[in-house]
Interface confidence: low
Amino acid sequence: MDLWQLLLTLALAGSSDAFSGSEATAAILSRAPWSLQSVNPGLKTNSSKEPKFTKCRSPERETFSCHWTDEVHHGTKNLGPIQLFYTRRNTQEWTQEWKECPDYVSAGENSCYFNSSFTSIWIPYCIKLTSNGGTVDEKCFSVDEIVQPDPPIALNWTLLNVSLTGIHADIQVRWEAPRNADIQKGWMVLEYELQYKEVNETKWKMMDPILTTSVPVYSLKVDKEYEVRVRSKQRNSGNYGEFSEVLYVTLPQMSQFTCEEDFYFPWLLIIIFGIFGLTVMLFVFLFSKQQRIKMLILPPVPVPKIKGIDPDLLKEGKLEEVNTILAIHDSYKPEFHSDDSWVEFIELDIDEPDEKTEESDTDRLLSSDHEKSHSNLGVKDGDSGRTSCCEPDILETDFNANDIHEGTSEVAQPQRLKGEADLLCLDQKNQNNSPYHDACPATQQPSVIQAEKNKPQPLPTEGAESTHQAAHIQLSNPSSLSNIDFYAQVSDITPAGSVVLSPGQKNKAGMSQCDMHPEMVSLCQENFLMDNAYFCEADAKKCIPVAPHIKVESHIQPSLNQEDIYITTESLTTAAGRPGTGEHVPGSEMPVPDYTSIHIVQSPQGLILNATALPLPDKEFLSSCGYVSTDQLNKIMP
């Protein structure tokens, strides 16, 4: 036949290893490792007495051997000699040549051994058993599928630790990979399975497969003997090899007492849960008392600075020099320069309603027998009395993450009833770009420019460009009553030692281009937009009507530096939600408290001020907002 001549020619041409044509002797094998099974019974027409393959195995991916049964063949003469033929397949090839087993001896009786010269890891093999020229069994496989490593060797163990009660112990079991497994070069990557049991038990406990040659075994009972064994397999292919020799582990009794049953005293668990519980309680306490704790740690010390006077003079308490400076400018009684650069910012915190019934430090500073207003003091002074926020060290390093919110105005968060005040800077040079510039106050929701990296950016003002600047008061709902100047400015010190203070009120934010309506507008209207505001909850409750155009003369001294302006914005939504706050009082003007002299010096940190300049619609306006605290002024007071 032409085909046989072709095959013979190819074989003689030395292509036996390269040529991997194949015979379609494909056996259907179950998903279980076929190398441990006989051929599917459905494949056979011959009797079960005939020889059949039992297993093919490669211990190290470099050689393999196949074994078959030959139970009754020795005693029967009708069957010829059993021969094994093999062929190597290329998946594209159909025709092939069959070659006889290269070594019937090395792997033992009824076996064929393929050394490394006959083993190719990537090419599939087909093998068949023949007797008297007829095929009695056949299998096909790739070498990777039949990898079954030799057992791990040199098992040993060491004690890791013993439980507090002395009843249980942990051990570390170690072993070595089989000698013939080429682990170092990565030709074989073995995974190991450790099994252990008590000597008198029958069922082995299996641990998860691991890639290392050691593993801890936990919670073994002391005074018991254990058997440990390990087996390995080629990772991602092949089957587990034989188990190693059994390692016996005996754990001697180490405690003075023994227990029949397991006795667990979970000290660690108790400690962990205890610490966890204490931590939770501490957090709950801290969060519930957050504002009071803050007031204790950072008492309210806003620091107004005297315009035109070196703060070092104030710090050193040189009263004469201060008086001299102020006396020279006897005519200098300015209406408040709201664009003054020495204004200290004060962080505002809104208390929960239930906290307002308790007397705060601020209350104590302001209190007198006839003038206490606990329930109306809705804004706490969180200023720590540190240096001006315009100074670089605070700019760069002193902002707490909690004090700066993620790029959103408090106005846009009406659900937030309390929290830290956002510290923001509005660039008056850039006000034309701000959302307030083009938007009509009736429709535009105020928003704030978030400084890069959540840090306030100092921005210069343009106050020097105009000496007469109209402050167009834009109006908002009470939830945004956070942008109005209510600063007490020290404008003079009398020879008697009284400090004379002037009010200031001016809108430093971008002026709306939308025309203000001539009629009176209530404070409860949308988009009240004033910056640098410290506005009390008590004031917010009034919804005081305002005339739309209030002119404030700004007498700018050329000698004064126009420094950076910082504003704070804080949600005052507790006022926003209150009913009955929208009553209009036609014709009334915006009350501006005019603090003209010190009324009482209660403590080195607190000054109570008399308000005499303007009639107020309600006395509580003063009681809730009329105070200034300073750690500089106390040094120059008698």
Epitope: A24, W94, P124
Partner: antibody, heavy 125, light 108 residues
């Protein structure tokens, strides 16, 4: 996408010759085995010939030995069946098919997994 | 050469019927048997290879089995698109590849 396209069929007189082509695409032709299978009108399938592009080995059915020659041009990804001394009984639709050892879950099987659409060869006087 | 004897040569069945086609090899071919489906004017399509392995994309209602030299193709529930001619084929080299004569499945 694997595609096999036959061409070259037609009417030929007995004793004449014809060359069929099978243009392959979508797989590595250089390592492939191409078979020709024919089907006479109203009859069953009959395997004709086979070539291994890689090894260059060929095999033929007894009925066409000595008359048909199978070849392949790997540069063109094309297999050819040169048919000489055609007889009337060679009239059939000739299909080229890719032969492949399919391996899945320990099961091997050689089969024709992709076929061309066929080309009709009519041998008639 | 190995002969593949297919039976029946034709059969009539209804949609939903269980259909069985058998193929007997004249000698042992191991499991090297494939089954194909062919519709008129079209090329055959592979259904089963290695006697019982379902080729990818083939509906699971098709199955194959082997008992010695007898091979069976079963369609568990005949569908309208299953009416066609079915062929068995052995690839037990080094013999020439041979097909069965085909079984035509017709609508009853």
């Amino acid at each position: 996408e694997v595609q096999l396209v036959e061409s070259g069929g037609g009417l030929v007189q007995p004793g004449g010759s014809l060359r069929l082509s099978c243009a392959a695409s979508g797989f590595n032709f250089s390592y492939s085995s191409i078979h020709w299978v024919r089907q006479a009108p109203g009859k069953g399938l009959e395997w004709v010939a086979y070539i291994s592009s890689y090894y260059g080995s060929t095999s033929y059915a007894d009925s066409v030995k000595g008359r048909f020659t199978i070849s392949a041009d790997t540069s063109k990804n094309t297999a050819y069946l040169q048919m000489n001394s055609l007889r009337a009984e060679d009239t059939a639709v000739y299909y080229c098919a890719r032969g492949y050892w399919i391996y899945y879950q320990y099961a091997w099987g050689y089969a024709f997994d992709y076929w061309g659409q066929g080309t009709l060869v009519t041998v008639s006087s | 050469d190995i002969q593949m004897t297919q039976s029946p040569s034709s059969l009539s069945a209804s949609v939903g019927d269980r259909v069985t086609i058998t193929c007997r090899a004249s000698q042992s071919v191991s499991s090297a048997v494939a089954w194909y489906q062919q519709k008129p004017g079209k090329a055959p399509k592979l259904l089963i290879y290695s006697a019982s392995s379902l080729y990818s994309g083939v509906p699971s209602r098709f199955s194959g089995s082997r008992s010695g030299t007898d091979f069976t193709l079963t369609i568990s529930s005949l569908q309208p698109e299953d009416f066609a001619t079915y062929y068995c084929q052995q690839s037990y080299g080094p013999y020439p590849l041979t097909f069965g004569q085909g079984t035509k499945v017709e609508i009853k």
